[in-house]
């Protein structure tokens, strides 16, 4: 019986037309929702004029349906199985789902004038900067509603800045009408321990943002996982979100629905400094802000990022040192609300509901030679906005998994 | 390659006026911001005016405004800085700059002597 069930699994779980795992992975049958909250800074004039904390009030949440496109370019390889495929980006606003409107005003640290400021460090490049802060009427914090935060806004300071220059900002911008990719996975024909692996990422193994074993592409995109899943394992994903492989670990037993899944967690030692767990010294890039390495819980991802300062943690900077944090006023961490999960089926590998929660900071420094960083007497790491996405496995597609999955195994 | 070359520096006395000009060749002029600066004697060398890219926003230190114009002329590639009501404090040596985005750093020219004196 057990052969002959393994042998349908190991069947069905292949990334070919006519499977079980192949309908539901070129358009998800999950619903997808990312729940974002703004922080709000209190207290604008204090900080740039005093260099005082940073005090943030977050507001959210605000909620937009995601990954409800189908994958494009779907594209099988008989040679090495594989199949590759693009990942759209789209996202519908959800009012009912949201505490407000998309129209809803922030107070935000100027992300244009944060990002040129470290950018460009020569002194008289900082002068011509402030010239063009000053003539713009910018300054260090700016109001914006959440849809120009989230998608994109022509920035005043950025349209005076010379030739070549994307005067649009936004946290997410571009977004709508693109696409993630290209992804070249494994099938699993020849393999199924390798099936949704992934084999390279815009057509390389490596990121080319890290040194060593940092810049690696692992395992899967979390959506699923090879089948047969032991607790014992490490699962690995990569996240284009956050430029870097990751990986969770078994937590506990929980019951979905009906369907025994094994909550898999992204432990706190993922996200700790190179003296607590080595793995991660190629994760530090520079001495000074991670003060010679010893502050975790923040990733510099500028590298990603053109240069610009932004760096990911968790919510709240959970898991982050209080060096981190010292500076931000409003913060209140905990475990439940702000870490990320990934329930799985241990039979087929796949990730039936999962919660994937980060915060997107810039990072600010004072300027000698730029007015409205003059005052400043420390760096920060602002907190934007976090995000929690989130999906669940809907009651219908539950059953057909209960009746065709785990009720045949029990 | 890049060459920014300044003239029009001289000896003048308060009150006067002069215009300096730089002349730009080896990067595609009109896409560049155009800056003054000037570096008087033991001091460090500062933003004096700037104008940018087509629209030609222009900019001035508090204590050159009403007294100094910059302008820029994209066929003949050159940048010019009129200089009236000169003062003695205007006494500096007076250095062409271009930059755009692509740069971390100015281009810049050789610098031309102003003296305000009498």
């Known amino acids: 019986g057990d052969l002959l069930i393994q042998k349908t699994i190991k069947k069905q779980v292949v990334l070919e037309e006519g499977t079980i795992a192949f309908k539901n992975w070129v358009k998800t049958g999950t619903e997808v929702y990312r729940q974002f909250w703004i922080f709000d800074v209190q207290n604008p004039q204090e900080v740039m004029m005093n260099s005082s904390n940073i005090q943030v009030k977050q507001r959210g949440p605000y909620t937009y349906r995601v990954r409800f496109l189908a994958k494009e370019n779907v594209t099988q390889d008989a040679e090495d199985n594989t199949v590759s495929f693009l990942q759209p980006n789209g996202a519908i606003f959800e009012p009912s789902l949201s505490v407000g409107t998309e129209a809803d005003n922030f107070t935000v640290l100027n992300l244009a004038v944060a990002a040129a400021s470290h950018i460009y460090q020569n002194q008289f490049v900082q002068m011509i900067l402030n010239s063009l802060i000053n003539k713009s009427k910018s300054s260090m914090f700016q109001v914006r509603t959440l849809r120009e935060l989230l998608w994109g806004y022509r920035d005043p300071f950025l349209s005076l800045v010379p030739y070549p220059v994307t005067t649009t900002v936004g946290l997410f911008y571009p977004y709508n009408n693109t696409a993630d990719g290209v992804y070249k996975v494994f099938n699993g024909k020849d393999n199924i321990s390798k099936v949704a692996i992934i084999d390279t990422y815009k057509g390389k193994r490596n990121l080319s943002y890290w040194e060593s074993h940092c810049d690696m592409i692992n395992g899967t995109d979390a959506a699923s996982f090879p089948p047969f899943v032991e607790k014992s394992q490490v699962l690995q994903f990569f996240s284009s979100d956050i430029c870097r492989s990751i990986y969770a670990v078994f937590e506990s037993d929980v019951n979905l629905k009906g369907i025994p899944v094994y909550r898999f967690v992204l432990p706190s030692k993922a996200f700790a400094s190179p003296v607590e767990n080595p793995d991660n010294y190629c994760f530090c890039t520079e001495k000074i802000i991670s003060k010679n390495c010893t502050s975790y819980g923040v990733l510099d991802i500028s590298k990603c990022k053109e240069g610009r300062p932004v760096y990911i943690s968790l919510p709240h900077f959970l898991y982050a040192s209080p060096d981190v944090s010292e500076p931000i006023d409003g913060l209140n961490p905990n475990e439940e609300e702000h870490r990320t999960y990934l329930d799985i089926e241990p039979i087929t590998g796949f990730t039936l509901q999962f919660a994937k929660r980060l915060q997107v900071n810039l990072l600010v420094k004072p300027s000698e030679k730029i007015q409205v960083l003059k005052n400043l007497k420390r760096n920060y790491i602002v907190p934007i906005l976090w995000l929690n996405e989130t999906g669940t496995i809907g009651d219908e597609k539950a059953n057909m998994f209960r009746s065709q999955v785990t009720g045949k195994i029990n | 390659q890049v060459q920014l070359q300044e003239s029009g520096g001289g000896l003048v006395q308060p009150g006067g006026s002069l215009r300096l000009s730089c002349a730009a060749s080896g990067f595609s002029f009109s896409t560049y911001a155009m800056s003054w600066y000037r570096q008087p004697p033991g001091k460090e060398r500062e933003l004096v005016a700037l104008?940018?890219?087509?629209?030609?926003?222009?900019d001035y230190a508090d204590s050159v405004k009403g007294r100094f114009t910059i302008s820029r002329d994209d066929a003949e590639k050159t940048v010019s800085l009129q200089m009236n009501s000169l003062k003695p404090e205007d006494t500096a040596v007076y250095y062409c700059?271009?930059?755009?985005?692509?740069?971390?750093?100015?281009?810049w020219g050789q610098g031309t002597q102003v003296t305000v004196s009498s």
């Open positions: 104008i940018t890219t087509t629209g030609g926003t222009t």
């Open positions: 700059s271009a930059w755009r985005a692509t740069l971390l750093k100015p281009y």
